[in-house]
Amino acid sequence: EPPTACREKQYLINSQCCSLCQPGQKLVSDCTEFTETECLPCSESEFLDTWNRETRCHQHKYCDPNLGLQVQQKGTSETDTICTCEEGLHCTSESCESCVPHRSCLPGFGVKQIATGVSDTICEPCPVGFFSNVSSAFEKCRPWTSCETKDLVVQQAGTNKTDVVCGPQDRQRA
């Protein structure tokens, strides 16, 4: 009797279990009682990444330089093109359809994690003993200068945005 379910990598059509097309190929014609499924390779700018019965291959993603995108990995007949962002930019979503500039950490904040093509800069507040006096996408919080090691004394306390100011020690008169 005609099957009601088919094996893996097959599909049911007109009471026939037909082989699916392998990744990188599209369906031309379903199998019949007397013939196999017929498949054709996707063209150079197209792909199909699963066992399928698609009659059209998908177009490779276009990495649009006007949106700050560049090719990270060229697509094949079985895989889509992977885009990433140009230097100084990162993706706005997981699918990386557009890019935005990396965020800079404001004074008082330092870079905890430098941005990549797919993730933004992560900033952190400078803790006590550290400062950042610049807006930067690269600079970490820097430690306050140690006046003691220079045989100096603190003349002005540091903040999260400024370094300490060191000065000479007051000389004791006999």
Epitope: V28, S29, D30, T32, E33, F34, T35, E36
Partner: antibody
Framework: EVQLQESGPGLVKPSETLSLTCTVS?????????WNWIRQPPGKGLEWMGY???????NYNPSLKNRITISRDTSKNQFSLKLSSVTAADTAVYYC?????WGQGTTVTVSS | DAVMTQTPLSLSVTPGQPASISCRSS???????????LNWFLQKPGQSPQLLIY???NRFSGVPDRFSGSGSGTDFTLKISRVEAEDVGVYFC?????????FGQGTKLEIK
């Protein structure tokens, strides 16, 4: 339901060309399947002659050498057989078939 | 070509009794995908062949379940579990794995 119907002359002279047409109803010959011509000489078995595919490409039995041509007219949903340089050995019942469905067959006699 | 040899060439069976027909190919009919395109047909007297079994063991729509097909590679069998009067005619196997497609020479089934 799919139906096939052969038509053409029942008598052909030796050395002439045998021409038959198969009219298909209930299914488009461009959708899928291979559309075959098969013959059966009197009192003998079945012989596959060739087919035309849904996409218009062909395959022929090498035993018929360069004598056979199968073509189609998609506007009429028909496919046709031409067999040249016929002899008495080509006398047979000629069937057009999708294999799951067959025409009723037409008798062709080769005689002067 | 794949030469198809059927045995026996004739068969006389009492109604209600089983019948078995063998078809042997000169080469394997299993293709590179593991599918085998071996079919069985019945040609009743004065009629066109009708499909009984396709791809070795699949009954075509409307074919009674007393007909079954089995086999693999080069050896295939058609079984009728209980022969009925309407089963008379010539049974053919046909392979469509390899071009040219080739038929067995036929087995004539008669009723005792």
């Amino acid at each position: 339901e799919v139906q096939l119907q052969e038509s053409g002359p029942g008598l052909v002279k030796p050395s002439e060309t045998l021409s038959l047409t198969c009219t298909v109803s209930g299914y488009s010959i461009t959708s899928n399947y291979y559309w075959n011509w098969i013959r059966q000489p009197p009192g003998k078995g079945l012989e596959w002659m060739g087919y035309i595919r849904y996409d218009g490409s062909n395959n022929y039995n090498p035993s018929l050498k360069n004598r056979i041509t199968i073509s189609r007219d998609t506007s009429k949903n028909q496919f046709s057989l031409k067999l040249s340089s016929v002899t008495a050995a080509d006398t047979a019942v000629y069937y057009c078939a999708r294999l799951d469905y067959w025409g009723q067959g037409t008798t062709v006699t080769v005689s002067s | 070509d794949a030469v198809m040899t059927q045995t026996p060439l004739s068969l006389s069976v009492t109604p209600g009794q089983p019948a078995s027909i063998s078809c042997r190919s000169s080469q394997s009919l299993e293709n590179t995908n593991g599918n085998t395109f071996l079919n069985w047909f019945l040609q009743k007297p004065g009629q066109s062949p009708q499909l009984l079994i396709y791809r070795v063991s699949n009954r075509f729509s409307g074919v009674p379940d007393r007909f079954s097909g089995s086999g693999s590679g080069t050896d295939f069998t058609l079984k009728i579990s209980r022969v009925e009067a309407e089963d008379v005619g010539v049974y053919f196997c046909l392979q469509v794995t390899h071009v040219p497609f080739t038929f067995g020479q036929g087995t004539k089934l008669e009723i005792k």
